[in-house]
């Protein structure tokens, strides 16, 4: 069971300084920006991240978003990334969801997060290269010091 | 509690192959992998590479990619590491070892090297 | 790829004394490392994990701190089944890499 608490407007980071943004395909890619461009390209760079109470604390659950014309939330069905056009729901009677991750950071580094599934153990967001791209990806992982499954995360509040 | 039982010693000679087996017992949760270790009599233990059952998908150390095979049979529950051209530098134990996630008390995950297989004695020799 | 220097190499101490087993990487690898104990014709054995968390069933007289580049193991009252070797691993990134190894023997 997940419970939704507060949400924050974030800007999400690669470990490359590179920025989140959600393209006009609705596709989230990383892109070399400087604070101007981020603000410009608002609000496909800022994130609405929820946070949610989990009855099996696991770290802390929270569901990725943005509103554009419409509010989009990151999905990771059938462990494929994509965002889906609905809010970020209240209550999730569920152990496990497509939309939850588990917002950690990672040990030693309280600025460096990593984004684990709820509904595959093992697999983090990450942001890998495809072609000229650098795409926002669901990853297995077992390298938990690979900085593709790191990211920064700055309050945009 | 899982056991992992790998196959028995073996005595070969330069050049030939030896493939090691690693037969899982006991419950074990999904999302683990096996990985390989060896270790040269009176030596360290030296990391070989891992085999993940779920997409058969490997990594292996440099010093062995050209010369080790990892595999596994999900309907046995059993993995096996082959390494050819061998040569007297490769007498050592060999150990299969499963790799799965542990976690702390704020669910932040660790991968850990939690049972051993009792090792294999490969003793190449002409 | 990432080096362990595992130090000493080796430690000769008597039962109820306080030994301590460092190991250092050659970069970053966060709190991703483990100790292992050996003992003769056997297999390795967690102790630690996650650089400070005790494995269950571990005595608690084991414990490891350390974050980023810097470990340390310490037994704090050797008892007689402590003599055995020691390794330390990151697993911070592939080729996973060991120390080198500390025996200890008693005095």
């Known amino acids: 069971y997940f419970g939704k608490l507060e949400s924050k407007l974030s800007v999400i980071r690669n470990l490359n300084d590179q920025v989140l943004f959600i393209d006009q395909g609705n596709r989230p890619l990383f892109e070399d920006m400087t604070d101007s461009d981020c603000r410009d390209n608002a609000p496909r760079t800022i994130f609405i991240i929820s946070m949610y109470k989990d009855s099996q604390p696991r770290g802390m659950a929270v569901t990725i978003s943005v509103k554009c014309e419409k509010i989009s939330t990151l999905s990771c069905e059938n462990k494929i990334i994509s965002f889906k056009e609905m809010n970020p729901p209240d209550n999730i009677k569920d152990t496990k969801s497509d939309i939850i991750f588990f917002q950690r950071s990672v040990p030693g580094h309280d600025n460096k997060m990593q984004f684990e599934s709820s509904s595959y153990e093992g697999y983090f967001l990450a942001c890998e290269k495809e072609r000229d791209l650098f795409k926002l990806i669901l990853k297995k992982e077992d390298e938990l010091g690979d900085r593709s499954i790191m990211f920064t995360v700055q309050n945009e509040d | 509690q899982v056991q992992l039982v790998q196959s028995g010693a073996e005595v070969k000679k330069p050049g030939a192959s030896v493939k090691v087996s690693c037969k899982v017992s006991?419950?074990?949760?999904?999302?683990?992998?096996f990985h390989w270790v060896r270790q040269a009599p009176g030596k360290g233990l030296e990391w070989m590479g891992r085999?993940?059952?779920?997409?058969?998908?490997?990594k292996y150390a440099e010093r062995f990619k050209d010369r080790v095979t990892m595999t596994e049979d999900t309907s046995t529950d059993t993995a096996y590491m082959e390494l050819s051209s061998l040569r007297s530098e490769d007498t050592a134990v060999y150990y299969c070892?499963?790799?799965?996630?542990?976690?702390?008390?704020?669910?932040?995950?660790?991968?850990?090297?939690?049972?051993w297989g009792q090792g294999t004695l490969v003793t190449v020799s002409s | 790829d990432i080096q362990m220097t595992q130090s000493p190499s080796s430690v000769s101490a008597s039962v109820g004394d306080r030994v301590t087993i460092t190991c250092l990487a050659s970069?970053?690898?966060?709190?991703?490392l483990t100790w292992y104990q050996q003992k003769p014709g056997k297999a390795p054995k967690l102790l630690i994990y996650?650089?400070?968390k005790l494995q269950d069933g571990v005595p608690s007289r084991f414990s490891g701190s350390g974050s980023g580049t810097d470990f340390t193991l310490t037994i704090s009252s050797l008892q007689p089944e402590d003599f055995a070797t020691y390794y330390c691993?990151?697993?911070?990134?592939?080729?996973?890499?060991f120390g080198q190894g500390t025996k200890l023997e008693i005095k």
């Open positions: 070892t499963t790799w799965r996630i542990y976690r702390d008390s704020s669910g932040r995950p660790f991968y850990v090297m939690d049972a």
């Open positions: 006991g419950e074990i949760s999904t999302g683990y992998y």
């Open positions: 085999i993940d059952p779920e997409d058969d998908s490997t």
């Open positions: 970069e970053d690898i966060y709190t991703y």
């Open positions: 996650g650089a400070n």
């Open positions: 691993l990151q697993g911070s990134k592939f080729p996973l890499t």
